[in-house]
Interface confidence: medium
Amino acid sequence: FERTRSLQDPCSNCPAGTFCDNNRNQICSPCPPNSFSSAGGQRTCDICRQCKGVFRTRKECSSTSNAECDCTPGFHCLGAGCSMCEQDCKQGQELTKKGCKDCCFGTFNDQKRGICRPWTNCSLDGKSVLVNGTKERDVVCGPSPADLSPGASSVTPPAPAREPGHSPQ
């Protein structure tokens, strides 16, 4: 099948890092500087991404793969392939239109990025609050008083807190 296809379309023989040059009888030409083709049979090469300003280069562009960017210190990536850089805030804050603002009561953010999320509602799991939440930390849920039978040890280790980043809608 590959042989048949290449007889029909000479461009299918052009490997990654080249393009099928219509101006030169469809021969395979290397991608020009600052461009790449990540698959074979391409009729053009894509322009390399440039990591400028708040972006910095994590991986240089090559003839077969695009450059990869991340963000300078004090900023973090958003979206696929670090589409954007956004400024960090402190733990216990989130970024708003007016800059970094403290989390409202009942919410927390334990990172320098992302949004303030509601404290875990322990009662939904039939538990009680063992350690109160703060702006920076979720509550820690433990067994409810009813679960502690008379004579039971009061140093029973608490149930693990809900996994970070997952709180009720």
């Epitope: 958003l78 979206g79 696929a80 970024l95 239109k97 990025r113 992302g114 999320r117 980043g165 709180s167």
Partner: nanobody
């Protein structure tokens, strides 16, 4: 389980308008995005909006496209006006989780701008 489902794509004439929607479920999303991928080309960023309403646009769509978000319905929108042939692409909704550590994707909706 996170789900992002786009709708609203279709065929429209140059200069026309279209409104895309993306229904999201399964997590709290800090930031929601639109990306697009023209046939045979790289996926490209279109716009994003944060949970508290901050927006940003690619230069190629600024002034023509408007991103918005209904947090109560967990739905993202893209109002596309003054459409051009070069806007033809599969449009994808994407969303970062509350900690900006993971990006989820929809399945895409095709927008064709042609006379």
């Amino acid at each position: 389980q996170v789900q992002l489902v786009e709708s609203g794509g279709g065929l429209v004439q140059p200069g026309g308008s279209l409104r895309l929607s993306c229904a999201a479920s399964g997590d709290i999303f800090s930031i929601m995005f639109w990306y697009r991928q023209p046939q045979g080309k790289q996926r490209e960023y279109v716009a994003h909006i944060t949970s508290n309403g901050r927006t940003n646009y690619a230069d190629s769509v600024t002034g023509r496209f408007t991103i918005s978000r209904d947090n109560n319905k967990n739905t993202l929108y893209l109002q596309m006006d003054s459409l051009r042939a070069e806007d033809t692409a599969v449009y994808y909704c994407a969303a970062d989780d509350a900690t900006n550590t993971r990006t989820y994707w929809g399945q895409g909706t095709l927008v064709t701008v042609s006379s």
